[in-house]
């Protein structure tokens, strides 16, 4: 039975040219996390594997950095980075848990940094 829940940084905004941290946190389950995938729409950005560590998709290598933790840092943001991002937790034996983050990249310097709530 899947009892876990994923908390995410929710809807966030950042300034063009800047960077942002995408974070998810899985709680309320005893399941063991074996892999976390980060995706943007249908594109795989990165994988954090419990055994093999991080793998960043070649097309994002210059602008994506692993961490902190199981999170992902997006750098050199462009307006085209606006959209939905998903963290997909593969857990044993529960299955997959998916969290959603919406990022808006703003031209203006008044972009609001940070999250709706903090991840532990």
């Amino acid at each position: 039975m899947m009892t876990g829940t994923i908390e995410t940084t929710g809807n966030i905004s950042a300034e063009k040219g800047g960077s942002i941290i995408l974070q998810c946190h899985l709680s309320s389950t005893t399941a063991q996390v074996t892999q976390v995938n980060w995706e943007q729409q249908d594109q795989l950005l990165a994988i954090c594997n419990a055994d093999l560590g991080w793998h960043i998709s070649p097309s994002f290598k210059d602008r994506v950095a692993p961490g902190p933790g199981l999170g992902l840092t997006l750098q050199s943001l462009t307006v085209n980075d606006t959209g939905e991002y998903f963290c997909i937790y593969h857990t044993y034996p529960d299955g997959t848990y998916t969290g959603r983050i919406f990022l808006e990249v703003l031209e203006s310097s008044v972009a609001e940094h940070g999250a709706r709530f903090q991840i532990p």
């Epitope: 005893t30 063991q32 074996t34 093999l52 593969h90 044993y92 034996p93």
Partner: antibody, heavy 122, light 107 residues
């Protein structure tokens, strides 16, 4: 070489306790969940449950609660199964088995210990 | 709980035969099924995972197929060492039960 090596066969009297060990080598112990499987003589395989090798949190399948305890010593890459108040019906081979595969659609028990025969007899 | 039923329970065949073992699930389990081979007095050995993916080092005469509720393990040409017991296991929802086993015997 990835392997799981279990402790040797054990003969116990009813009411006694037994501890079966499962020593892992050749891989990162805390990256893969560990399972315990029972096989009574002449019978099939029964999944007893598993232990989270990151947190040490055990989960027991119905029928294996109470007298059965899964534990870990990550400093020596070893998982343990302890059975207390042994009964004749606990006589079986006990296997530890690693959950391989990293994504939910590829999980399977990819590495097994050789098995430990526990005989309960007065 | 999801139950798995293997058929047949016993199978008599000869070296070189093509044999098929079926595993039926009591509800849909997608492709979350594994097949194991067990020699007497030995630990099970993983043959197939994700219904059809051959585990590294397993001979290509073994293959798996199916999805949903019906799955098959096929041995294209039985070898002397294949006359042992085979189990299916689902990995879709707790608890991860095994089938009752199929013993392949020499005719």
């Amino acid at each position: 070489e990835v392997q799981l090596v279990q402790s040797g066969s054990d003969l116990k009297k009813p009411g006694a306790s037994v501890r079966v060990s499962c020593k892992a080598s050749g891989y990162t112990f805390t990256s893969y969940p560990m399972n315990w499987v029972r096989q009574a003589p002449g019978h099939g395989l029964e999944w007893m449950g598993w232990i989270n090798t990151n947190t040490g949190n055990p989960t027991y399948v119905q029928g294996f609660t109470g007298r059965f305890v899964f534990s870990l010593d990550t400093s020596v890459n070893t998982a343990y199964l302890q059975i207390s108040s042994l009964k004749a019906e606990d006589t079986a081979v006990y296997f530890c088995a690693r959950t391989g595969g990293h994504t939910y659609d590829s999980y399977a028990f990819d590495v097994w210990g050789q098995g430990t025969m526990v005989t309960v007899s007065s | 709980d999801i139950q798995l039923t293997q058929s047949p329970t016993f199978l008599s065949a000869s070296v070189g035969d093509r044999v098929t073992i079926t595993c039926r699930a009591s509800q849909v389990i997608s492709s979350s099924l594994a097949w194991y081979q067990q020699n007497p007095g030995k630990a099970p050995k993983l043959l197939i995972y994700a219904a059809s993916t051959l585990q590294s080092g397993v001979p290509s005469r073994f293959s798996g197929s199916g999805s949903g509720t019906e799955f098959t393990l096929t041995i294209s040409s039985l070898q002397p060492e294949d006359f042992v017991t085979y189990y299916c296991q689902h990995l879709h929802g707790y608890p991860y039960n095994f089938g009752q086993g199929t013993k392949v015997e020499i005719k």
